[in-house]
Interface confidence: medium
């Protein structure tokens, strides 16, 4: 089943997010991902925890998952590198790098996204864009076309309140508001983009979606710059 958590969003402009990837298992969408280099897609480590007996591939240049599109191409995966400290059952270090079988063919609809290297929190209230093919309602309806939503960043202190995530949000994580608009199941591994720069990756715990007291949790990529660079080197 797809992992992660977009509720309350709308259909994205086709191919306006050329960095967007669909991580697929046995030909079906599993998680989001983001092209960070010609041959590398960043996603969430949890996405692979149940994929051991399946074929993992990455779809780039897509808006619709099912319809033919000139820019769409499915890539095999050469190497899957989860963060070495990731655990299947915690949200910490929930990052995965997938090396494509070959360099992606770049164009208007396929382009890597610059990612944040300066390890500094995004200012609370900043509007950031999250996109994905995750479920769009509580009944579990999955969209065929890419959805997106703008979400304000939530300060860590509020996110860590006992009524919210009760101290689980470390300095390597960030939160975004989740009042009816939220990332949801199937969006895990997808990008949180602030000012045209990748700031976060949707984590893939089993959080309820669209509840303002359970904000969306995102892994801060700047906190993992050294690891990302070491794998891509």
């Amino acid at each position: 089943p797809p992992r992660g958590r977009i509720l309350g969003g709308r259909e994205a402009e086709a191919h306006a997010r050329p960095y967007m990837a669909s991580v697929q298992l046995n030909g079906a969408h599993l998680c989001g991902g983001v092209l960070v280099a010609e041959q590398w897609v960043l996603s969430a480590a949890h996405c692979l925890e149940d994929a051991a007996d399946g074929k993992v591939q990455v779809l780039l240049g897509a808006h619709s998952l099912s319809q033919p599109e000139p820019s769409k191409r499915l890539y095999d995966v050469l190497r899957a590198v989860p963060h070495p400290d990731s655990q299947p059952d915690t949200i910490d270090h929930d990052l995965l790098l997938l090396q494509l079988s070959e360099k992606a063919t770049l164009g208007p609809a396929v382009r890597p996204l610059p990612w944040q290297r300066v390890d500094r929190d995004v200012a609370p209230g900043t509007l950031c864009d999250v996109a994905g093919w995750g479920i769009v309602n509580h009944a579990g309806r999955r969209p065929d076309s890419l959805q997106h939503v703008l979400l304000p960043v939530l300060d860590r202190a509020t996110c860590n309140r006992r009524t919210h995530h009760d101290g689980a949000i470390t300095e390597r994580l960030m939160c975004a508001e989740s009042n009816r608009r939220d990332s949801c199941k199937g969006d895990s591994g997808g990008p949180l983009v602030c000012g045209g720069v990748l700031e976060g990756v949707v984590t893939s715990g089993s959080r309820v979606c669209g509840n303002r007291k359970k904000p969306g949790i995102y892994t801060r990529v700047a906190s993992y710059a050294a690891w990302i660079d070491s794998v891509l080197a």
Epitope: A45, L48, E49, A52, D53, V56, V77, L78, R79, A80, V81, P82, P84, S86, Q87, P88, D89, T90, L98, Q99, G205, S206
Partner: antibody, heavy 121, light 111 residues
């Protein structure tokens, strides 16, 4: 320091039942998957069962040799882990180890000292 | 099930020499660039101890004389130089597919 302490082993007759326990300490128990692995006297190791955490809906997995007879469970509030064994057979005689696994590659990194189960008529 | 065949079943090595234990899998244990193969050491009356994960990663606290190599279906554990403390049974184990399986074991003795 990670510690796993098994208990509940004993001598019983075929078709009998037994419940093994494992007390865990020294790590955040509720975020780890746990396993039972057994070793018959003078023999090799055999993986028996695995249970994942709450965030993975406590998914369970069993070896074919124990399926429908053994049940794995856990109590996160007590950091306890269990193996309920029914319809025991002589070939279930073994040392039973409680084992933690870590990471996406399912590495069994910490093992308890084991508890002995003997099934004999 | 993936069957792991270890060889030799027993091995006698002089102190200071090299011991090599092999493990062959009935099918590949590769998972997108990582070999899901572990090695354990078990001394009499003790539980197994993890030595090496993912074919070649030596666990923290394990002496540098232990090393692992291999990919696909063929793997080996090397101990060099062998010390008295290394007398034990050694097992390989795959975590590529459930059920996870172990090799039959290799008994290391000192000549």
């Amino acid at each position: 320091e990670v510690q796993l302490v098994e208990s509940g082993g004993g001598l019983l007759q075929p078709k009998g039942s037994l419940k093994l326990s494992c007390a865990a300490s020294g790590f955040t128990f509720n975020t780890y998957a746990m396993n039972w692995v057994r070793q018959a006297p003078g023999k090799g190791l055999e993986w028996v069962a695995r249970i994942r955490s709450k965030s993975s809906n406590y998914a369970t997995y069993y070896a074919d040799s124990v399926k429908d007879r053994f049940t794995i469970s856990r109590d996160d509030s007590q950091s306890m882990f269990y193996l309920e064994m029914n319809n025991l057979k002589t070939e279930d005689t073994a040392m039973y180890y409680c084992v933690r696994d870590r990471g996406y590659y399912y590495v069994m990194d910490y093992w308890g000292q084991g508890t002995s189960v003997t099934v004999s008529s | 099930d993936i069957v792991l065949t270890q060889s030799p079943a027993s091995l006698a090595v002089s102190l200071g020499q090299r011991a090599t234990i092999s493990c062959r899998a009935s099918e590949s244990v590769e998972y997108y660039g990582t070999s899901l193969m572990q090695w354990y050491q078990q001394k009499p009356g003790q539980p197994p101890k993890l030595l090496i994960n993912a074919a070649s990663n030596v666990e923290s606290g394990v002496p540098a004389r232990f090393s692992g190599s291999g990919s696909g279906t063929d793997f080996s554990l090397n101990i060099h130089p062998v010390e008295e403390d290394d007398i034990a049974m050694y097992f390989c184990q795959q975590s590529r597919k459930v059920p996870w399986t172990f090799g039959g074991g290799t008994k290391l003795e000192i000549k």
